[in-house]
Interface confidence: low
């Protein structure tokens, strides 16, 4: 669509007459019609298969026609099509003589024509004024012409039509060509899709309108490139969504069965060697002189009694000090410097002369032990403490310190290793001779029904449009992720682009 | 006030012969271009030939170049077409019209119409 423009500039009739040579009275009031067809090599009658138009008076004999409009005609005239301009045209020019103000052929006379002219040739589509001149005998006619394409047309041709916008349509302004050009922040053949926020990424994000970056279910971070793990996921991470892949020293479905007590709690003191010994449970292996499951107790080197014939005991920083009693030396007081007749044996022990007096011996009663019958039978030079406890003296009395899994006087009794409910997901626990058994529900297995097993929610490619299926471990289900263009918990729906568009 | 008024139209075997007459009358008869279109039902209205005022062109359409003639009359003001060879296809309402230009056919102006029928 277009428009032939025809700009009237100089109509020259200097003598005042008609193309029979008869003059006008008292002057040729002129005005013009015009007529545009398609090209013939010989203009001949025939349709104005392009259009025609025609002007009131502009003027009388010889006159200048002025840019603007002129007594309500329009210069210049306006000659509108709405076809492909084929670059070619045939035009005819009349000027015709109007005795008075009617200008209908009725009212004029039968000779009122003043002259004719006809032009074919070529022309393209442009701003540029074509500037041309006609004369006759008796007139001579300066005009100039040009087509242009009419509003939102474009082309060689004003054959490609091109209307701005910036709605859900599309977002774009037209080129000289007719070609669109996008907006900032738009994309596509129409414009219509958002380019998204630099560096958003191209699966797992999308975007509604330009410098956005939505995340897709499982994704979250500014770009969307970070999956988000299973939810519950304590010391765990994922590379794909609903993942908990557990970091070091962590077990479970969600991370968070500690398998390195002794890294993350340190609970062996005094420079005690943690050793791991299974889920939250460890053993300490003390330096000398501490004791305790967490080697938290100093022992004092004097609870083994290591001085003999009555001597005392000191506790030092490094060790021990035997104080001797009258008649012994040595670092336990176990050299002698008495004979039976300084009667040496105490609570009621016997006194046996030796080496010709020289030395002696005490025969003790029971509960009493030493070189003069002066200790007490230790209570656990018998290991009394079973399933490896540790006995302690204590005073008159003794007690066994038991090992994580037992209990009682003598640490007699095994703890039911099903006490703490070690079986996860309602598995049922069974005590063994050596340990325990989880007995898992349908769903679990593991050695404590720990790993999920149940029925893959994406086995039955719920997800359409090659969306990527998650397993939701937590609920059995799926999630879907969607390729761009498509919505819905399926990805089932199209974007909603209407079939056709407006232009 | 310009008046057209046809004449002539009626019903005519496949080969057959009609001549159709134009009255003008309210105008100056010579100085403009007068010509004959014709509109079949359902169909766009189809230009057939018209004649000039100056030097008497004659311009016909491809589809009836050959068997149709117009003239004119100046003297009576009347326009003819004289249709030969005529085929159903010719079957129309055939309108006379005025341009206001000299040279060129343009629908200006027209009458009521004649119904032309070529039937066996």
């Known amino acids: 669509s277009g428009v032939f423009q025809l700009q009237l500039q100089e109509f020259i009739n200097e003598r005042g007459v008609l193309a029979s040579g008869r003059p006008c009275e008292p002057g040729c009031r002129t005005f013009f019609r015009v007529c545009l067809k398609h090209f013939q090599a010989v203009v001949s009658p025939g349709p104005c298969t392009f259009g025609t138009v025609s002007t009131p008076v502009l003027g009388t004999n010889s006159f200048a026609v002025r840019d603007d409009s002129s007594g309500g005609g329009r210069n210049p005239l306006q000659l509108p099509f709405n076809f492909t301009w084929p670059g070619t045209f045939s035009l005819i020019i009349e000027a015709w003589h109007a005795p008075g103000d009617d200008l209908r052929p009725e009212a004029l006379p039968p000779d009122a024509l003043i002259s004719k002219i006809a032009i074919q040739g070529s022309l393209a589509v442009g701003q540029n004024w074509l500037l041309d001149e006609q004369t006759s005998t008796l007139t001579r006619l300066r005009y100039s012409y040009r087509v242009i394409c009419s509003d939102n047309y474009y082309g060689d041709n004003c054959s490609r039509l091109c209307k701005k916008r910036n709605d859900h349509f599309g977002h774009y302004v037209c080129q000289p060509d007719g070609n669109l050009s996008c907006l900032p922040g738009w994309t596509g053949e129409y414009c219509q899709q958002p380019i998204c926020l630099s560096g958003c990424h191209e699966q797992n994000g999308y975007c509604s309108k330009p410098a956005e970056c939505l995340c897709r279910p499982g994704w979250q971070g500014r770009l969307c490139n970070e999956c988000i793990p299973h939810n519950g996921c304590r010391h765990g991470t994922c590379s794909t969504p609903w993942q908990c892949t557990c970091d070091e020293g962590w077990g479970g479905l969600f991370c968070d069965q500690d398998l390195n007590y002794c890294t993350h709690h340190s609970p062996c003191k005094n420079g005690a060697t943690c050793s791991n010994s299974g889920q939250r449970s460890y053993t300490c292996t003390c330096r000398p002189g501490y004791t305790g499951v967490d080697c938290e107790l100093e022992l004092s080197e004097c609870d083994s009694n290591p001085c003999r014939n009555g001597g005392s005991c000191k506790d030092q920083e490094d060790g021990y000090h035997c104080l001797c009693p009258p008649g012994y030396y040595g670092l336990h007081c176990e050299h002698s410097t008495l004979s039976c007749a300084d009667s040496p044996c105490f609570n009621g022990g016997s006194c046996r002369e030796r080496n010709q007096g020289a030395n002696y011996a005490c025969e003790c009663p029971p509960n009493f032990t030493g070189s003069n019958c002066e200790k007490k039978v230790d209570r656990c030079t018998s290991n009394p403490c079973a399933n490896g406890g540790q006995c302690l003296n204590r005073g008159p009395s003794r007690m066994c310190r038991c090992r994580p899994g037992f209990t009682g006087t003598y640490c007699e009794l095994h703890v039911s290793d099903c006490a703490r409910n070690p079986c996860a997901h309602g598995g049922t626990c069974h005590d063994l001779e050596n340990g325990l058994m989880c007995t898992c529900p349908a769903g679990f297995s593991g050695r404590r029904c720990e790993v999920r097993t149940s029925i893959d929610a994406c086995a039955s490619s719920p997800c359409f449009n090659r969306a990527t299926c998650y397993t939701d471990l937590s609920t059995d289900t799926f999630v879907c992720n969607c390729p761009y263009g498509f919505v819905g918990s399926r990805c089932e729906f199209p974007v909603g682009l209407p079939p056709s568009f407006p232009w | 006030e310009v008046q057209l008024v046809e004449s002539g139209g009626g019903l005519v075997q496949p080969g057959g012969s009609l001549r159709l007459s134009c009255a003008a009358s309210g105008f100056t008869f010579e100085n403009y271009a007068l010509g004959w279109f014709r509109q079949a039902p359902g169909k766009e209205r189809e230009w057939v030939s018209c004649i000039s005022s100056s030097d008497g062109t004659t311009y016909y359409a491809d589809s009836v170049r050959g068997r149709f003639t117009i003239s004119r009359d100046n003297a009576k003001n009347t326009v003819y077409l004289q249709m030969n060879r005529l085929k159903p296809e010719d079957t129309a309402i055939y309108y006379c019209?005025?341009?206001?230009?000299?040279?060129?056919?343009?629908?200006?102006?027209w009458g009521q119409g004649t119904q032309v029928t070529v039937s066996s």
């Open positions: 019209a005025l341009s206001l230009g000299s040279s060129w056919c343009a629908y200006d102006y």
